[in-house]
């Protein structure tokens, strides 16, 4: 096959998908904030977004998109969907994906979620400053 | 089969802006990334910047300050739009595409040769 | 940005022999066991055309006459037998980093 197996992308082309990324995020976050005021951030999720192991960071994809499947069902899917779409690329292809359950009250779903969205859009940013940081 | 064309102005003169289209057939401009490339009278090829499936795009830093690419979907064009041109940007522009992660850019227009002179 | 060092700038091969033509990043473009190297060939007044893809891959419809080889910072083209039809100028071009940056060219002439 042309394309080269998904976790093994140069950093140019994971800066490519992190730039398709950021304005999904982005858009996403600002919709959720618009519609659900007054959300406070869960102090409870947190979303271990970057890998540990790699110089310069990597989006631990694999981490991330169980929260994504998670909360699909209760947000704009259609936008979800091209993130999950994103981040299928950026997968290790035998790193295991963990269940994950959104909470059942819905004052604290909400802040799950929002606390999701903004996590993940922070977390972009991080990557993205280490891409455009190397020697460029 | 893909084809790239690029087309636009063959003169232009200094401060002035250069804008060249690169018509596509065969393939649509929102799958892939879509690329603008010069070569130098002496042969250098440089890379400019892309405009991706979705729009967003991405260019050189050495040319950051002075370049835009865009697109229409309606008619499958992307653009190169580059200003403040001097001597210096004189050069063949071609327009390629990367169809692929971990690929290479496998269509390439047939080139354009843009002179900035007054 | 990462700089491609082509060698030689030029090369005068007899017909049938072999043609060998490198290129050296100033840093290393492999991620996991991939080279993100590639190869073009440009005839005079024509567009590049890929040659190989991801350093040692043959782009589809090019003749089993070209190679690639290499990894990390160091690698090659060869083009064996060489015949009339292969002037041209070749470039490689790295995709690991932004921005894209290609080596300065290769003409090969015919002795």
């Known amino acids: 096959s042309h394309m080269a197996p998904t976790h093994q992308l140069p950093p140019s082309d994971v800066r490519k998908i992190i730039l398709e990324l950021q304005p999904l995020s982005r858009g996403l976050l600002e919709d959720y904030q618009k519609k659900e005021t007054g959300v406070p951030e869960s102090n409870r999720t947190l979303l271990l977004c970057l890998t540990s192991d790699s110089q310069p960071p990597r989006l631990n994809s694999s981490a991330i998109l169980p929260y994504f499947r998670a909360i699909r069902p209760l947000s704009d899917k259609n936008i979800i969907d091209k993130i999950i779409e994103q981040l299928d690329k950026l997968k290790f292809q035998h790193e295991p994906e963990t269940e994950i359950s959104v909470p059942a009250d819905t004052f604290e779903c909400k802040s799950f979620i929002l606390t999701i969205l903004q996590q993940f859009s922070a977390c972009l940013e991080s990557v993205f400053k280490s891409l455009n940081s190397g020697p460029q | 089969e893909v084809q790239l064309v690029e087309s636009g102005p063959s003169l232009v003169k200094p401060g002035g802006s250069l804008r060249l289209t690169c018509s596509v057939t065969g393939d649509s401009i929102t799958s892939g990334y879509w690329n603008w490339i010069r070569k130098f009278p002496g042969n250098k090829l440089e890379y400019m910047g892309y405009i991706s499936y979705s729009g967003i795009t991405d260019y050189n830093p050495s040319l950051k300050s002075r370049i835009t690419i865009s697109r229409d979907t309606s008619k499958n064009q992307y653009y190169l739009q580059l200003n403040s041109v001097t001597t210096e940007d004189t050069a063949t522009y071609y327009c390629?595409?990367?169809?692929?992660?971990?690929?290479?850019?496998?269509?390439w227009g047939q080139g354009t040769l843009v002179t900035v002179s007054s | 940005d990462i700089v491609m060092t082509q060698s030689p700038a030029s090369l005068s091969v007899s017909l049938g022999q072999r043609a060998t033509i490198s290129c050296r990043a100033s840093?290393?473009?492999?991620?996991?066991?991939?080279?993100?190297m590639h190869w073009y060939q440009q005839k005079p007044g024509q567009s590049p055309k890929l040659l190989i893809y991801r350093a040692s891959n043959l782009e589809s419809g090019i003749p089993a006459r070209f190679g690639g080889s290499g990894s990390g910072t160091d690698f090659t083209l060869t083009i064996d037998p060489v015949q009339a039809d292969d002037v041209a100028t070749y470039y490689c071009q790295q995709s690991y980093e932004d921005p894209w940056t290609f080596g300065g060219g290769t003409k090969l002439e015919i002795k």
């Open positions: 840093e290393s473009v492999d991620t996991y066991g991939n080279s993100f």
């Open positions: 390629a595409r990367y169809g692929n992660y971990g690929y290479a850019m496998d269509y």
